[in-house]
């Protein structure tokens, strides 16, 4: 599973080198007689045997479909065809940032807590053999480390690590020079010991509605990775086709604690949706926060002083 | 750009369990296959086990078949590693890496990773 393709959608940033591995590569070595061929089809064209003649950037092996390097007019569905075996793909080949070292839609973040050991490591167990060298780059800067071949950086968090760490390998092929970058997106954060989760906003919210409309009641907390947030109303916990919880939404703050919001939709507002409390809880190890929300019938907004409204 | 923060290690006796999770924010979490890798102390990076978007299939590396789960949950944006009968071998930092690839080839011990101490 480590070694061959196994994602039928892949995204790659154009200019570098790529390579698809079919998934029955060990298969294809016991039958080595079978006729084993790729194919491509890209919008009108219908599928078009690939080989090493109809592009002097494809490369075939046994079990690989290599591109030296890979171009935007390589997007398309390309299959892999082996006796009654077939494997396909859809390959999106995407712009390279010109202004960048790195493309942001090839990146991925992680938080680091201040003084705790972190640790950045340039590998790329495909084109292993032929990487000249490697080098590590922060913010597109290159950093001067000893190790060429797999630079390294082990250390103890400060915040001035907070950056983007461009792994970019330079490989040789056919007398051409090729580079492969990976970037880490390094943020680092204060501690991140657990808070006592919170609701925000008001405790009690009267909500003005009209009968046989929608209304949607949202629910924010600052809350913990494992901390829950959930809605409780009436009786039995959807018993009311009307009533439905939309999926929950997290965004993670610059502290490293959770901004969370969980909507509960009411359509077709009944009579019986009215002066009924609907709850949500933030449940977490250090206790729970509850606010409630009443629906109130729009022509009854005279009774309630106009504080306590909600939109 | 997908963002991961991985946690659930600690000391466990030889024998005993973990649950590892690794929350998900900042981009569809569902357009990457997720997986698991660890660096024991000096050791090399390993791949530990991984999971697909499309169809859930996973790969366990043979160190841990038959005592590790790998699961994802899609509505919470969340990965799991639960690990049972763990033994002082599995004693490392773990590493929580998405790939839009699904070649695991690009080495994924970064970042701060979550310890696990197997120790009695």
């Known amino acids: 599973a480590e070694s061959c393709t196994s994602r039928p959608h892949i995204t790659v940033v154009e200019g570098e080198p790529f390579y698809l591995k079919h998934c029955s590569c060990s298969l294809a070595h016991e039958i080595e007689t079978t006729t084993k061929s790729w194919y491509k089809s890209s919008g009108s064209q219908e599928h078009v045997e690939l080989n090493p003649r109809s592009s002097s950037r494809i490369a075939l092996h046994d079990c690989v479909l290599e591109f030296w390097p890979v171009e935007l007019n390589d997007t398309g569905s390309y299959f892999f065809q082996m006796k009654n075996y077939t494997q396909k793909w859809k390959l999106n080949v995407i712009r390279r940032n010109k202004h960048s070292c790195f493309t942001e839609r090839q990146v991925t973040s992680k938080i680091v807590e201040v003084k705790k050991f972190f640790q950045i490591t340039c590998e790329n167990s495909y084109y292993q053999t032929l990487v000249n060298s490697t080098s590590l780059y922060k913010n597109c800067k290159k950093l001067l480390l000893e190790n060429n071949k797999n630079p390294t950086i082990k250390k103890n968090a400060e915040f001035e690590d907070q950056g983007y760490y461009s792994c970019v390998h330079f490989l040789h092929h056919n007398g051409k020079l090729f580079n492969i970058t990976k970037t880490f997106n390094i943020t680092i954060v204060e501690d991140r010991s657990n808070i006592v989760p919170v609701l925000l906003g008001p405790k009690l919210n009267h909500v003005a509605v009209e009968l046989g409309k929608n209304v949607r009641l949202n629910c924010s907390a600052l809350l913990n990775e494992e901390d829950v947030i959930y809605w409780m109303f009436g009786e039995e916990n959807g018993s009311d086709p009307n009533i439905h919880e939309e999926k929950e939404m997290r965004i993670m703050t610059p502290e490293g604690k959770w901004h969370a919001s969980k909507v509960l939709r009411i359509e077709n507002i009944g009579e019986s949706n009215l002066n009924v409390l609907y709850n949500c809880t933030v449940a977490s190890t250090g206790g729970t926060d509850t606010k409630s929300f009443i629906l109130v019938r729009k022509a009854d907004m005279a009774d309630i002083p106009g504080h306590v409204f909600t939109r | 750009e997908v963002q991961l923060v991985e946690s659930g290690g600690g000391l466990v006796q030889p024998g005993g369990s973990l649950r590892l999770s690794c929350a998900a924010s900042?981009?569809?979490?569902?357009?990457?296959?997720m997986g698991w890798y660890r660096q024991a102390p000096g050791g090399k990076c390993e791949l530990v086990s991984t999971?697909?978007?499309?169809?859930?299939?996973?790969y366990y590396a043979d160190s841990v078949k038959g005592r590790f789960t790998i699961s994802r949950d899609n509505s919470k944006n969340t990965l799991y590693l639960q690990m049972n009968s763990l033994r002082a071998e599995d004693t490392a930092v773990y590493y929580c890496?998405?790939?839009?690839?699904?070649?695991?080839?690009?080495?994924?011990?970064w970042g701060q990773g979550t310890l696990v101490t197997v120790s009695s």
């Open positions: 900042g981009s569809t979490f569902d357009e990457y296959d």
């Open positions: 999971i697909s978007t499309i169809d859930a299939s996973t």
């Open positions: 890496e998405a790939d839009d690839r699904g070649t695991w080839d690009r080495g994924g011990c």
